[in-house]
Interface confidence: low
């Protein structure tokens, strides 16, 4: 009969910029040689050629040189395709066509995803707020895919649906920046939270702002920084916000601004004698020179590293002086967990198996939760280890030992406590005897 070609039923989810494997397998007959094999990968809808193997040779990538086969595994029936540096435009269905004596094909879906950044919150107006004032709160989250769902709520968790305007704009790579605007009338004080959800990654990113209307005290220079830590993703740029109120007639010649590490007093950046004296912090800091005259003393920290985490002091001296400290909390999202099973062949009910859940390059340390198909937590026989690499990013490996029932689903959830990002993987073990991953 026709050749049976097997691919995963569920879409393959791949993060933008990572590599994805589109699994495809067939059952080679005894005496099969690669000279007999014709393998074609193509886009299902357009029939565009992606990669091929014919006449005993890999014919190479026809898809922007970003695809590869697994040549050493072809003879065993593994026709999987590696797609490198995944882009949004890659999303869709790929057909794996295998011809030996007979032929067969199957289509595998690629679902592309990108985590949304922790939302940044801005307030307009942001000074001299009094109860009864109308304010516009903007929640912005960047570079995610697919389009996000946005939810607002107040400090009591009550959803806020009125006066919300949400817009999502795709950039040239197809990644979305989401901006959601809430207009509210201030009470005596209030907390407003914005949650940005990635429906594919089931990743929730949220931020909140607490507004306490009050009059500013007079006297010394009042230096204002955010109460909450600034959360920055590793490798991105962070703005440590700091502002002061310039008096009428203020000129930059009067300003002395010093940023330093709070604990060690190490100089980070300074502006004195009317001039930006530059970065003393690995050339990764910058001020906003055009905004200094308006009282914006914020610091831009580029290419954030785990080692940057901590407290930074903003010291402003004009005639009087003042200072305030802002905390930088560094974070990195955990990758979608990969699941492995040991043993992974000929499994029968009653067998003890070890399921390993691995998630990579996150920060800070993750919380790991296991549960069964009914959502019941599995806490016994779990060993979780987290190792930091030289950049301080953690790889987490959690091992669950279970005795198999007739069938069962085991889910692992890796939570980033700072980003409030949940990444999860699951494995379903059914039937007997069985093999994992399923073989052709």
């Amino acid at each position: 009969g026709a050749l049976e070609v097997q691919v995963p039923e569920d879409p393959v989810v791949a993060l933008v910029g990572t590599d994805a494997t589109l699994c495809c397998s067939f059952s080679p007959e005894p005496g099969f040689s690669l000279a007999q094999l014709n393998l074609i990968w193509q886009l299902t809808d357009t029939k565009q050629l992606v990669h091929s193997f014919a006449e005993g040779q890999d014919q190479g990538s026809a898809y922007a040189n970003r695809t590869a086969l697994f040549p050493d595994l072809l003879a065993q029936g593994n026709a999987s395709l590696r797609l490198q540096r995944v882009r949004v435009a890659d999303e869709g269905s790929f057909t794996c066509f295998v011809s030996i004596r007979d032929f067969g094909s199957a289509a595998v879906s690629l679902q592309v995803a990108a985590p949304y950044s922790k939302p940044s919150m801005t307030l307009e107006p942001n000074k001299d707020l009094r109860p009864g004032d109308t304010v516009t709160i903007t929640c912005s989250s960047y570079q995610g895919y697919p389009e996000a769902e946005v939810f607002w709520q107040d400090g009591q968790g009550v959803p806020l649906t009125g006066n919300v305007t949400t817009s999502q704009m795709a950039n040239e790579q197809g990644l979305f920046d989401v901006h959601s605007i809430l207009r509210v009338v201030l009470g005596a004080n209030g907390t407003y939270s914005c949650l940005v959800r990635n429906p594919v990654l089931q990743q929730d990113a949220h931020s909140s702002v607490t507004i306490t209307p009050q009059r500013s005290p007079t006297g010394a220079v009042e230096v204002q920084v955010p109460e909450d830590p600034v959360v920055a993703l590793v490798g991105t740029d962070a703005t440590l916000r700091c502002s002061f109120s310039p008096e009428p007639g203020f000129s930059l010649a009067q300003l002395n601004l010093i940023w330093q590490l709070t604990d060690t007093k190490q100089l980070v950046h300074s502006f004195t004698e009317g001039r930006d004296q530059g970065s003393a912090y690995a050339n990764r800091t910058a001020l906003f020179p055009d905004l200094l005259a308006q009282g914006n003393a914020s610091l831009r920290l580029q290419r954030v590293r785990v080692a940057d985490e901590g407290s930074f002091t903003c010291f402003v001296s004009i005639r009087d002086f003042g200072s305030a400290a802002v905390s930088l909390q560094v974070a990195a999202p955990y990758s979608k967990p990969s699941m492995t099973l040991e043993p992974n062949k000929d499994l029968r009910p009653g067998d003890t198996v070890t399921i390993t859940c691995s998630s990579y390059r996150g920060y800070p340390e993750a919380e790991v939760f296991w549960q069964d198909g009914q959502g019941v937590p599995l806490t016994g026989n779990v060993t979780t280890s987290q190792m930091a690499n030289e950049q301080g990013l953690f790889d987490v490996h959690s091992v669950l030992r279970v005795v198999l029932g007739a069938n069962g689903t085991y889910s692992c959830l890796v939570r980033n406590p700072v980003l409030q990002q949940d990444a999860h993987g699951s494995v379903t073990i059914t039937g007997q005897p069985m093999t994992f991953p399923p073989e052709a």
Partner: antibody
Framework: QVQLVQSGAEVKKPGSSVKVSCKAS????????ISWVRQAPGQGLEWMGG????????NYAQKFQGRVTITADESTSTAYMELSSLRSEDTAVYYC???????????WGQGTLVTVSA | EIVLTQSPATLSLSPGERATLSCRAS??????LAWYQQKPGQAPRLLIY???NRATGIPARFSGSGSGTDFTLTISSLEPEDYAVYYC???????????FGPGTKVDIK
């Protein structure tokens, strides 16, 4: 402290191949780009190609395409550059270099002199 | 393939003088441009990355500027240890392919 240590000098015959190694210590090997740059006697710097070990992707200058192969062994934190079909004009000092973040080469190996002579 | 041209080929200056080295790309390289210094018998040393950022440990007398196709390395006041060959290097966005310029030799007048 990041260090790149290259293999020793080589004398090769025209038409043969040479494989130079570059062992990295300090920093996470996989996360940085490794470049290979050569310099013929009295000449300028010439970028041959590079690899990002974590991706396993090598890129080559057009001039060397098909003649150079750059690989990386993450388990030993070692990068390799193999140049085939050697000719006398390939006589040069070959350097490996590594970035601090991104691509720019902050750290360089000590150089390996390859002499191609009949 | 992007070609880099450096001028002048040789710059003869006295200590304390200002050195201005130019690098021109055959097409725009945004700010993906680095400057390296090389002394005889030594490996090159990164001075400037992303057109204008000083690398760690590089003295403030070195500065870089420019974007697109025209870039400048300035040494505000030459020190004896600055006499060397200076190379500019560009990087394409993806794939990351690099090209060096032919170099400018700064020697003592």
């Amino acid at each position: 402290q990041v260090q790149l240590v290259q293999s020793g000098a080589e004398v090769k015959k025209p038409g043969s191949s040479v494989k130079v190694s570059c062992k990295a210590s300090g920093g996470t090997f996989s996360s940085y780009a490794i470049s290979w740059v050569r310099q013929a006697p009295g000449q300028g710097l010439e970028w041959m190609g590079g690899i990002i070990p974590i991706l396993g992707i090598a890129n080559y200058a057009q001039k060397f395409q098909g003649r150079v192969t750059i690989t990386a062994d993450e388990s030993t934190s070692t990068a390799y550059m193999e140049l085939s079909s050697l000719r006398s004009e390939d006589t040069a000092v070959y350097y490996c270099a590594r970035g601090d973040s991104g691509y720019d080469s902050n750290y360089w190996g000590q150089g390996t002199l390859v002499t191609v002579s009949a | 393939e992007i070609v880099l041209t450096q001028s002048p080929a040789t710059l003869s200056l006295s200590p304390g003088e200002r050195a201005t080295l130019s690098c021109r790309a055959s097409q725009s390289v945004s700010t993906y441009l680095a400057w390296y210094q090389q002394k005889p018998g030594q490996a090159p040393r990164l001075l400037i990355y992303d057109a204008s950022n000083r690398a760690t440990g590089i003295p403030a007398r070195f500065s870089g500027s420019g974007s697109g196709t025209d870039f400048t390395l300035t040494i505000s006041s030459l020190e004896p240890e600055d006499y060397a060959v200076y190379y500019c290097q560009q990087r394409s966005n993806w794939p990351p392919l690099f090209t060096f310029g032919p170099g400018t030799k700064v020697d003592i007048k």
